[in-house]
């Protein structure tokens, strides 16, 4: 078979292959940060000569062009500067607003690297219509002035600008706009993974409302649907899996799917993942019919084995025929449901879309969109039983209109979107579900997000002081229960002068609590064993305290999980009648555990628990200390196997401010205590004033550091005694 | 509930490879919390500690059978493996499949197999 | 050095109280397991860590520890209680494991 010639450079930039230079090949264009390839790919022919899609004359001289953003076209009751006929990168747009007019949005705007304007679209109004102004974004014009209720805006886009989002709004009776704000976008622009992740989360999240099913949760404001224990999602997912994907590709469509499908099943919401590829024909890989479909495992499995040669006899995009199997499984459900039955009409239903291009066969996707928009029955009440993300992945042979005609057009949501390659939709997919954000008590969640605060990672962080100084840490464990160390009480302080310092979305400093009661556990004395050499004594280092107030859940509080508590089994997706030892073997599952515990600064930090025939080697050191214990006779009476060990090898150590916090671990994008700070050989903030300043121990040092943790699967009857009615334990 | 089941030949003749597997039920050779072991017991005599295996492939073998001992772990089937080279009579016991767990000072044998009595003759 | 001394024999008459001993270097670092095994089954757990009993197991059956000596203490014997008694401990590192030669109780 001929090849294609290999004269296909591109000045300032760079080219990648789909399959070598054999016909068939699609070979993509990128260039650096700043600047776009026209054209922007081309496809070997079975001739042996390239094309370049969409080209009406001979091949052109691929070059690497500035990449601009689009000026506004016009601006109501206002005026915008500098006036330019579009933006170069890192260029400003102001907005000013006439007397009488307030102005709405971002008053400076700047334009990015890849295209698009950051901040929100300015306008200016004066708060007369039923409906807010709906302003204008850049490179858009409007048709239609009165904002009334029943009252409709149209939108197009000057020149060859694309437009995303909704092309006509109604100004609905609850006084919001239908549908989604129009973005007229460059052809070759695309969009940035952080501001994908947010936009798809945050509907995401909206979608799933990922109740705790063990409480019912009031109705937020917006569109915050609860899937009760009753209720129920489908989950369709679709992979482009045509000739201009990449091998490689695939397998990053597939790993991003895997996320998405591991987040999925962290909410605690019963789910169903359909998985379909699909080329020139669908492949169903997994059917929402199937019962495996419910089954984390199951569904990994089949996606694992989704295989790329699959399709390698029609390469074609047949994006119609996929989203038409989806509508059959639907049918097929409803068949077997029943359609008037509330089983089928309460599940809600969300598609996602990953592809590389437009479809080139099979007819229209909006056709069988509309088949599914039908069969669900979707109409302004029932509107959020279905979302539709479509995903375009390589900015190349994206079709911005065909994909924006078929993502859902919700209000304050995006659900269509085009990044730059692979690895942003990867990056995407690590972000996308962060459910940090809900309201109930859900457990053991937080926001791993790269630009999340200290707090925001780990919520159920606090500070325990007493009037003067602080001293301690603890963790919430439920919304009016800190676990922490006994040894902070050792000195019978009255309670009463102690607050508990809980974290506040309001305020960087946190929000104070009292405490109405602490129960320390009656088997600490710290001088138990004095007699034996021991000078102190940490054995039951635990107490609880009772908050007055509830502590009302938020990004910045929330509760970690216990194991061995039906909580922290929904959030291990473990079966019905899992045990404690089940949640031990799970949770403390190998010679030296990777863990962490939060630092005076607020920050995560690293250590290994040191478990089985490894945790006698890192407690034995503890005898070679002989200013805490002068005349050991026996380690054994010291580190008990209450204790977990850690501050081996590159450990970090905790300070002694540090006592009483979690020790934890995350499994499935949820964080799990399995211990709390108790005492340790070393402390490496001693002499600093600084609480960022911590000081590693010398290698030399006799005896090594090591660090103690109460192990909570050792505490079991003293915690169900007094938790018994605030969590739900399961079985020892 | 764990239950442990050995299986192999009974009868072997001196020189030969004892090879014994442990099928285990009710529990996972791939959890990372448990030392699959294997222990004999001659007849009349005390128990004997041949070997333990975790999962993650590190063993431990009696110094005294060292050189001949083999214990190896097949997550797939959930079994675990004992190879023992060049018997003699001096091998002839009741073997028995065990799991092990360390827990903070002691480490103990909470689940047995049921034994398989190997007999060593020409 | 790697090795549990047990009484080969011991007896008790019914109800009354016995105590069965394992000595052993690696008793100073590591705390005795005991099994009971009954002829012709497979041994059983019966205590392990500093005094530590598996469910099912009667409370009878209790342990200690000093020095380098390991004691099973069961108070109250019962007839079923007749059976072999093995300690093992561990000894070095990792998994090396160590088992006594076995006591047998006999109930008068």
């Known amino acids: 078979a001929p090849s294609c010639p290999q004269n296909v450079n591109i000045s300032g930039g760079t080219f990648t292959l789909s399959h070598g230079w054999a016909p068939g090949s699609l070979l993509t264009y990128s260039c650096p940060q700043g600047l776009y390839p026209s054209p922007a790919s081309r496809l070997c022919k079975s001739s042996g000569q390239w094309q370049t899609p969409g080209a009406t004359r001979s091949l052109s001289k691929a070059v690497c062009k500035p990449v601009r953003c689009p000026a506004p076209v016009s601006f109501e009751n206002g005026i915008y500067t500098p006036r330019l006929g579009s933006y170069p990168v890192g260029g400003n747009v102001s907005f000013e607003c006439e007397d009488g007019f307030i102005l709405r949005g971002s008053p400076v705007r700047q334009c990015r690297p890849n295209g698009m304007w950051d901040g929100e679209t300015a306008v200016c109004d004066n708060g007369a219509g039923h409906c807010p102004n709906p302003g204008i974004s850049l490179g858009a014009v409007r048709t239609g002035f009165r904002f009334g209720h029943g009252d409709k805006v149209r939108y197009r886009c000057s020149s060859n600008l694309v437009l995303t989002g909704s092309s006509e709004r109604e100004c609905q009776g609850n006084g919001v706009w239908s549908g989604t704000e129009p973005i007229c976008r460059q052809p070759y622009s695309y969009d940035f993974p952080e501001d994908v992740a947010p936009a798809l989360g945050t509907s995401f999240s909206h979608m799933l409302g990922a109740t705790n099913p063990t409480q019912k949760t009031k109705e937020s404001l917006g569109r915050k649907i609860q899937i009760q224990r009753s209720g129920h999602l489908n989950l369709y997912l679709l992979l482009d899996c045509s000739q201009s994907v990449s091998e490689n590709d695939f397998l990053i469509f597939k790993e991003s799917a895997s996320l998405m499908v591991d987040r999925i099943f962290s909410f605690e919401i019963n789910v169903s993942v359909a998985i379909i590829t699909f080329a020139s024909e669908p492949k169903v890989l997994m059917s929402v019919l199937n019962d495996n479909s419910r089954d984390m495992t199951e569904v990994i499995s089949s996606l694992e084995n989704a295989n790329y040669k699959d399709h390698e006899n029609g390469t074609g995009t047949n994006t119609y025929a996929a989203l038409n199997s989806v509508y059959l499984m639907m049918n097929n459900q409803m068949r077997l449901l029943g359609m008037e039955t509330m089983a089928w009409q309460e599940i809600r239903h969300a598609i996602i879309l990953l592809t590389d291009g437009k479809s080139n066969m099979g007819g229209s996707p909006k056709t069988a969109v509309d088949h599914i928009r039908e069969i669900l029955n979707i109409n302004q009440k029932r509107n959020d039983y279905l979302d539709i993300y479509a995903i375009g992945v390589g900015k190349l042979d994206v079709d911005w209109r065909e994909l924006n005609e078929l993502g859902s057009k919700k209000d304050g949501e995006r659900h269509a979107f085009i990044l730059q390659d692979t690895k942003a939709l990867h990056q995407v997919f690590e972000h996308m579900l962060d459910v940090s954000k809900l309201t109930d008590t859900i457990c053991g969640v937080g926001n791993m997000s790269a630009n999340a605060s200290d707090q925001e990672r780990t919520p159920w962080h606090v500070t325990i002081k007493p009037k003067s100084q602080e001293t301690c840490r603890g963790a919430l464990i439920s919304d009016q229960w800190v676990l922490t160390a006994a040894h902070c009480f050792r000195d019978g302080n009255d309670h009463s002068l102690w607050r508990v310092n809980v974290g506040d979305p309001k305020s960087q400093w946190g929000k104070e609590f009292l405490i109405e009661k602490a129960v320390i556990s009656p088997g600490f004395d710290v001088f138990a064993k004095k007699n034996q050499g021991i000078l102190e004594f940490y054995g039951d280092d635990i107490a609880l305290l009772k908050l007055a107030q509830k502590v009302k859940m938020s990004t910045h509080a929330r509760p970690i999980c216990l194991p061995c508590t039906m909580e922290a089994n929904l959030a291990l997706r473990r079966p019905q009648g899992s045990t404690c030892r089940d949640h031990e073997n799970e949770l403390l599952n190998k010679q030296s555990v990777p863990a962490h515990f939060v630092a005076l600064n607020g920050s995560k930090l690293n250590i290994n628990l040191k478990m089985g025939v490894e945790w006698t080697s890192c407690a034995e050191v503890v005898s070679q200390e002989k200013t805490m214990f002068p005349n050991l006779t026996d380690v054994r009476e010291v580190v008990t196997d209450q204790f977990l060990c850690s501050g081996t090898q590159e450990d970090e150590s905790p300070c002694k401010g540090e006592s009483g916090g979690a020790v934890f671990l995350e499994r499935r994008f949820r964080f799990f205590q399995v211990g709390l700070v108790s005492w340790g050989l070393y402390n490496p903030c001693l002499g600093s004033a600084d609480k960022n300043s911590r000081k590693r121990a010398p290698r030399s040092k006799v005896p090594p550091p090591r660090d103690f943790h109460i192990n909570l699967f050792r505490m079991q009857p003293w915690l169900r005694q007094h938790l018994g009615d605030v969590l739900n334990f399961l079985p020892l | 509930q764990v239950q442990l089941r050995e299986s192999g030949p009974g009868l072997m003749k001196p020189s030969e490879t004892l090879s014994l597997t442990c099928t285990v039920s009710?529990?996972?050779?791939?959890?990372?919390?448990y030392y699959w072991t294997w222990i004999r017991q001659p007849p009349g005599k005390g128990l004997e500690w041949i070997?333990?295996?975790?999962?993650?492939?590190?063993?431990d073998y009696n110094p005294s059978l060292k050189s001949r001992v083999t214990i190896s772990v097949d997550t797939s089937k959930n079994q675990f493996s004992l190879r023992l080279n060049s018997v003699s009579a001096a091998d002839m016991a009741v073997y028995y499949c065990?799991?092990?767990?360390?827990?903070?000072?002691?480490?103990?044998?909470?689940?047995w197999g049921q034994a398989t009595l190997v007999t060593v003759s020409s | 050095s790697s090795e549990l001394t047990q009484d080969p024999t011991v007896s008790v008459a019914l109800g009354q109280t016995v105590r069965i001993t394992c000595q052993g270097d690696?008793?100073?670092?590591?705390?005795a397991s005991w099994y009971q095994q009954k002829p012709g089954q497979a041994p059983v757990l019966v205590l392990y860590?500093?005094?530590n009993r598996p469910s099912g197991i009667p409370d009878r059956f209790s342990g200690s520890s000093s020095g380098n000596t390991a004691s099973l203490t069961i108070t109250g014997a019962q007839a079923e209680d007749e059976a072999d008694y093995y300690c093992?401990?561990?000894?070095?590192?990792?998994?090396?494991?160590?088992f006594g030669g076995g006591t047998k109780l006999t109930v008068l």
């Open positions: 093992n401990s561990r000894y070095s590192s990792g998994t090396h494991v160590v």
């Open positions: 690696s008793l100073r670092t590591y705390y």
């Open positions: 009710g529990g996972s050779v791939s959890s990372g919390v």
């Open positions: 065990a799991r092990g767990y360390a827990s903070g000072w002691s480490y103990y044998f909470d689940y």
């Open positions: 860590g500093k005094n």
């Open positions: 070997g333990s295996m975790f999962y993650s492939g590190n063993a």
